[in-house]
């Protein structure tokens, strides 16, 4: 039985041109995380964090994606096209795979606030 829980930053908004932290956290399990994959709404891989090998940022995102904090991801120079779903996939053993979802809305407005509350999807 998979006992763990993925907590994510949930639904967040950020300003165009700004940056945002995408954060997932796996809790309530002793499972060993072998790899965390970060995917965009169109299922393209942004980055991989492997326990043995460290971070790999995919070439298409190298200029705009920074690893961390922790197993999270920082998206920079946001454009309106960045609006959409983001997924963190935790590959673990013995539990198997855990998946978390974050929805990012990029706003033109200068009053856009980056809400970073944690919630369980």
């Amino acid at each position: 039985m998979m006992t763990g829980t993925i907590e994510t930053t949930g639904n967040i908004s950020a300003k165009k041109g700004g940056s945002v932290i995408l954060q997932c956290h796996l809790s309530s399990t002793m499972a060993q995380v072998t790899q965390v994959n970060w995917e965009q709404h169109d299922h393209s891989l942004l980055a991989i964090r492997n326990a043995e090998l460290g971070w790999h940022i995919y070439p298409a995102f190298k200029d705009r994606v920074a690893p961390g904090p922790g197993l999270g991801l920082t998206l920079q120079s946001l454009t309106m096209n960045d609006t959409g779903e983001y997924f963190c996939t935790y590959h673990t053993y013995p539990d198997g795979t855990y998946r978390g979802r974050i929805f990012l809305e990029v706003l033109e407005s200068s009053v856009a606030e980056h809400s970073a509350r944690f919630q369980i999807p």
């Epitope: 399990t29 002793m30 060993q32 013995p94």
Partner: antibody, heavy 118, light 112 residues
Framework: EVKLVESGGGLVQPGGSLKLSCVAS????????MSWVRQTPEKRLELVAE????????YYPDTVKGRFTISRDNAKNTLFLQMNSLKSEDTAMYYC???????????WGQGTLVTVSA | DVLMTQTPLSLPVSLGDQASISCRSS???????????LEWYLQKPGQSPKLLIY???NRFSGVPDRFSGSGSGTDFTLKISRVEAEDLGIYYC?????????FGGGTKLEIK
């Protein structure tokens, strides 16, 4: 090279306390679940404590629950085992161990001996 | 708890012989993920245990190919095709498909 070095063992009286340490090197300590395993004088192996990579989750078998506390300092690459209310049956060699490649105890330290005796 | 029973307790062999150690679990150790998390360790005299086999049949890095693991469900076997002097020690099976994770009692491989 993965290296795990335990320390802190020794002779302690029943009811006493001891704190074991395990210093890790050669890998990203904060990425791994870590465990303490003990081996009794009769050579039986028993998992006594586990802690998740962040330190947020811990596990203990009933034999040590409420007496032992596992913790970690990821900034110092160090794993700890605080042992209280020690009993003669806690006498054992204590090893820290790390998973890897789909295995639970891929790497072991050299061990530190704990003797509980009056 | 999953009880891991190893047989025999002691296994006297001649160098060059094949050795076989059995490990039986009190219930299936197939994890919900479909994997069977059964491992074999060797503890040589005066040393800490070392991983030989993981997930039933996968040799850990640096482990000679004379060691092989097999089995499924509740019955598992470690075979050493040609025993060498450096293989002597205590062999343990271990499962982590279920909590609490449990070891077998050990099998001592010794010279006949």
């Amino acid at each position: 090279e993965v290296k795990l070095v335990e320390s802190g063992g020794g002779l302690v009286q029943p009811g006493g306390s001891l704190k074991l340490s395990c210093v890790a090197s050669g890998f990203t300590f904060s990425s791994y679940t870590m465990s303490w395993v003990r081996q009794t004088p009769e050579k039986r192996l028993e998992l006594v404590a586990e802690i998740s990579s962040s330190g947020g989750s811990t596990y203990y078998p009933d034999t040590v629950k409420g007496r032992f506390t596992i913790s970690r300092d990821n900034a110092k690459n160090t794993l700890f085992l605080q042992m209280n209310s020690l009993k003669s049956e806690d006498t054992a060699m204590y090893y820290c161990a790390r998973p890897g490649l789909g295995a639970w105890f891929a790497y072991w330290g050299q061990g530190t001996l704990v003797t509980v005796s009056a | 708890d999953v009880l891991m029973t190893q047989t025999p307790l002691s296994l006297p062999v001649s160098l060059g012989d094949q050795a076989s150690i059995s490990c039986r679990s009190s219930q299936s150790i197939v994890h919900n993920s479909g994997n069977t998390y059964l491992e074999w360790y060797l503890q040589k005299p005066g040393q800490s245990p070392k991983l030989l086999i993981y997930k039933v049949s996968n040799r850990f890095s640096g482990v000679p190919d004379r060691f092989s693991g097999s089995g499924s469900g509740t019955d598992f076997t470690l075979k050493i095709s040609r025993v060498e002097a450096e293989d002597l020690g205590i062999y343990y099976c271990f499962q982590f498909s279920h909590v609490p994770r449990t070891f077998g009692g050990g099998t001592k491989l010794e010279i006949k």
